[in-house]
Amino acid sequence: LPKAPVITTPLETVDALVEEVATFMCAVESYPQPEISWTRNKILIKLFDTRYSIRENGQLLTILSVEDSDDGIYCCTANNGVGGAVESCGALQVKMKPKITRPPINVKIIEGLKAVLPCTTMGNPKPSVSWIKGDSPLRENSRIAVLESGSLRIHNVQKEDAGQYRCVAKNSLGTAYSKVVKLEVEVFARILRAPESHNVTFGSFVTLHCTATGIPVPTITWIENGNAVSSGSIQESVKDRVIDSRLQLFITKPGLYTCIATNKHGEKFSTAKAAATISIAEWSKPQKDNKGYCAQYRGEVCNAVLAKDALVFLNTSYADPEEAQELLVHTAWNELKVVSPVCRPAAEALLCNHIFQECSPGVVPTPIPICREYCLAVKELFCAKEWLVMEEKTHRGLYRSEMHLLSVPECSKLPSMHWDPTACARLPHLDYNKENLKTFPPMTSSKPSVDIPNLPSSSSSSFSVSPTYSMT
């Protein structure tokens, strides 16, 4: 006899782990055999959906590999045309081992700021999150807290907070560990020991001492009267995040020396400064030596161009260096009377500084040539037309004295201020705009304050009247 369908085994709640199999059973008695359909959250499950297997005339529904999105209410409906359709429903609860969906990452933070290390998790039941620092569980306190999200928040970061961290997510089904990350705490540069001021005699040696700390360990640079230190030797040592810098100077002029400690935090820098003055008690006569010696310029022609009390190199290959070099300048100077007002001050500065080169005193006094960049600018920019004429006359031997050749430096043989700023002298005449000045400033004996790339420095040949320099 025909019999309406009856569900003899109602659906029950099924617990399943992700990637495991889950089966619902819907046992039906009826005649004729019913048609059984399945729904999830009231949406029909299609017979050909490959994620499911429907067997035993539709009475068994198997989810072949459970995903967390399979959570929901599953219903089977049986109908054979006799009486009404019958339905039974049950829930699928997807259980999940803990999973860390947003793990922590390495962090660099400046001391005193707030750090947050993320640790977002998934799992059912909801995992609890704890943190490990080094090898020990991390204890929360007034500064350190694990947030509801699982992230670790550290207020007012201290140096001792630096270290290796990992988060741990745990529920009844298992435990997940994040990879180990590093929290680096950076500290602004500060000076622990400032250089001391000195009052010394001309030609004496002085050592300035500067100590600084910070994380990363700062670098120390020395500034002399606003420019990068041009002479003197620097010795540095680093121990326990403290850098110690000693600047040894041969004193030939008074100056303000500044120690600058700098360290980098991402794209930004922090700096600390301390300064000391060097004053000269009494001036003693410079020592002569067999190639040349340093002396103050006492001539007339270059008075307006060279700095007051400038130390210049006097070449002892001349019987009377001061007079011979003054004569050289004088000869060249006369040629400049006819040049343009743009060219003249530039050319005068170049000639005076080429013949009376700045002098670096020391065991062996050394002439400091003009930087090739300034030489080029004077020759090819300020005095382009005049220089062509001048060089043509030189090559054709039209000058009264062979000595005049000395007043025309060969720019390509001079050291570059970009490659080795300490190897050459600049012409401050070019540092000023003509609209800012009524007259051009005197020469200063400072070197260019420029970036020094990590490159081989210029090597100078032994001094001759017209020195040559090569850049290796």
Epitope: E373, C411, N433, V450
Partner: antibody, heavy 117, light 107 residues
Framework: QVQLVQSGAEVKKPGASVKVSCKAS????????MHWVRQAPGQGLEWMGI????????SYAQKFQGRVSMTSDTSTSTVSMELSSLRSEDTAIYYC??????????WGQGTLVTVSS | DIQMTQSPSAMSASVGDRVTITCRAS??????LAWFQQKPGKVPKRLIY???NLQSGVPSRFSGSGSGTEFTLTISSLQPEDFATYYC?????????FGQGTKLEIK
Amino acid sequence: QVQLVQSGAEVKKPGASVKVSCKASGYTFTSYYMHWVRQAPGQGLEWMGIINPSGGSTSYAQKFQGRVSMTSDTSTSTVSMELSSLRSEDTAIYYCARELGWGSDYWGQGTLVTVSS
Amino acid sequence: DIQMTQSPSAMSASVGDRVTITCRASQDIRNYLAWFQQKPGKVPKRLIYIASNLQSGVPSRFSGSGSGTEFTLTISSLQPEDFATYYCLQHNSYPYTFGQGTKLEIK
């Protein structure tokens, strides 16, 4: 007169290298530094680096460090610039230029390098 | 590295106008700044050297000023051939750096 003549246009695949040459004439080759500057289509000028042809000292912009190499051959008065690990954003006109800031500046005619898969 | 910021990045003006382009350096570059003009499909041409000096052969309507970190290029009376892109270049230290350019268009 001073002339800088560059090699012809190049088409390269990503990851490849390109070498652009610049032949100088009309002056003493070793007396002047040579710069390399590039310009992507519709973009501005970008300084890549400099070479001293006498001795071969170089200084490169940080952006190109490790990918660029500049060399000079005094026997042929030629400087070359090689850029490796090319990517599409390296598509540009590459110029050699003599003494950009300090002396008389002279420019090559430019070499178009196209990077495309 | 020294950053060079040019303003405006583009502007339109009429023949006869006075035009000023500014270039700002991220640190002191003394006077070591050059101005270049570039027309489409052409190589750049230097107009001004060492901040305020007119390159030989460049019309006197072009002038440069400034030192330290602030520089300007002025065209006193714009001519039809002046519509181009202008760049500043710092050559105080390596790496040299250009401004991003100012495109000057006809209004």
